[in-house]
Interface confidence: medium
Amino acid sequence: EAHKSEIAHRFNDVGEEHFIGLVLITFSQYLQKCPYEEHAKLVKEVTDLAKACVADESAANCDKSLHDIFGDKICALPSLRDTYGDVADCCEKKEPERNECFLHHKDDKPDLPPFARPEADVLCKAFHDDEKAFFGHYLYEVARRHPYFYAPELLYYAQKYKAILTECCEAADKGACLTPKLDALEGKSLISAAQERLRCASIQKFGDRAYKAWALVRLSQRFPKADFTDISKIVTDLTKVHKECCHGDLLECADDRADLAKYMCEHQETISSHLKECCDKPILEKAHCIYGLHNDETPAGLPAVAEEFVEDKDVCKNYEEAKDLFLGKFLYEYSRRHPDYSVVLLLRLGKAYEATLKKCCATDDPHACYAKVLDEFQPLVDEPKNLVKQNCELYEQLGDYNFQNALLVRYTKKVPQVSTPTLVEISRSLGKVGSKCCKHPEAERLPCVEDYLSVVLNRLCVLHEKTPVSEKVTKCCSESLVDRRPCFSALGPDETYVPKEFNAETFTFHADICTLPETERKIKKQTALVELVKHKPHATNDQLKTVVGEFTALLDKCCSAEDKEACFAVEGPKLVESSKATLG
């Protein structure tokens, strides 16, 4: 229903603490370069307005839309033109175009240093000195690096961060307590950021229908006991939630997400018995818990899908009368029976089923035409199953680091035009599929692998869209959301690529590499490996293995030498020459 003051309504609904957090995230995601203090000032102004409007809904500016309130604050910044350049041009537009313009300028790879974690003592001191400012900085730093982070989830991660600090800052060895816990939290939050980025890309690039289909499949797998209309209801509400968050409407998004969690908990008997473990928790934990629930058991005695979707005499009638309903029901029925399939595979099956009906229902004998439709799914199922089998075998054989390197070589050969930092980032992420999924039992491997790869490849698509350099990447990213992974898998080495000129500087190491943390040292080596492949795209795996082995030996030797810099100066050029000889 319409409220006299939207800002007062949202302040009352989400409460002051979450309101402040969501407003801070909103500004940080729009204005990624501003210092924290500038954001804190804007947040205070908006919060003061909200409080005034709660006291008197007819006070000045209380009838403004949230976009007007946020947009006017942004456009009043004196430093806007200097800091953000053409973002200032957005201010000449009226809502809703102004907000669309701000969204268009969100930067998925802002030029910001990596979020560095201070020493345990420093962290704990800052936490104890000013808790509010400490978590304000956390929200700001994460949000500006991840302009599509799912805002209510970021509030949840801030809460978890607080719980970890509360526990570990009292521990005898603060560092030993904090490091593993914060590493795990950071890992989860990075995956969460990438997952929401995929949802936003689905909605923005392929429309609501694409996300609705994705959500219908995933929720049917998770809640197979719920009936179709219940799943549809949740899908509709969830789509609204993510549309709002992806559109920068974070207060509405958090409010609607809380309403959906409440609805699901009120109807748990018709949705899933698993919900009870979530429903007594406070709102942020409740919603996070529901999102993370394991699939319910598939109900016993379900009839074969063929009964309703192949053998029934009314298949074409049902399809032609209400396509969305019938195809939605097909996806629901197939998905609730297949928690062992990935969401994208199930969506491919839905697409294949729809194409078959479209063709067959126009023939004289539709039934004869579509009778074998479910059998025709087999190649679509076999392809990702084989991919999982081959890659998990390779991972088990090579281990984490070398599996990443194998993917680094594979993807550099496929799309050598892509920038080296992007190839390193994407290949490292793709490589993590091994440790993340290959240890799972057979029935859980396929959904884990393929749905994770969809998230990682979306990151490639998003980064590539910012600076497009490869027609192949553009094609795989834009043609079909569900076929992205098979499209990339099917790419062979790019035979049109002109090898990169050799640059000795790229392969010159210095003593500073010895003091880098292990992860950063690996990234340096992997950067050199990508450059090597770009220089010699036809190098064999054995040749590359030899060169990488020699590089590793050089690092080991020089990093344990008395005079490290001298060692690199002498041994480095020798290695470059021997590598050239190895690679021909």
Partner: nanobody, 119 residues
């Protein structure tokens, strides 16, 4: 015993509007998804629209999208169908029914209300 009683049908000119109602009893209406189906003279049953127990989402047959609106009032145990821009091909007996939990079939429907679109 489940009872569904449709009303609101009648004769209307092309381009006109009608609002059908369906009073439900004998089951928990507010936990049941409902639908409207229709049967044109000499034809089989045709889906028209479906509504979830909470009021959203809704589904419409392609032939009525943008012209018909399904709604419900759970406090009155009543289902509605607002029909605008009526066409001759909308002439049919309209039935309300409980949405099936499994097959695209349904267990209960009323006696129907006749809608005739003619000039």
């Amino acid at each position: 015993e489940v009872q569904l009683l449709e009303s609101g049908g009648g004769l209307v000119q092309p381009g006109g509007s009608l609002r059908l109602s369906c009073a439900a009893s004998g089951f928990t209406f507010d936990t049941s998804s409902m639908l409207w189906v229709r049967q044109a003279p000499g034809k089989g049953l045709e889906w028209v629209s479906v509504i979830h127990q909470s009021g959203t989402p809704t589904y419409y047959a392609d032939s009525v999208k943008g012209r018909f609106t399904i709604s419900r009032d759970n406090s009155k145990n009543t289902l509605y169908l607002q029909m605008n821009s009526l066409r001759a091909e909308d002439t049919a007996v309209y039935y309300c029914a409980k949405f099936p939990s499994s097959r695209m079939k349904f267990d209960y429907w009323g006696q129907g209300t006749l809608v005739t679109v003619s000039s």
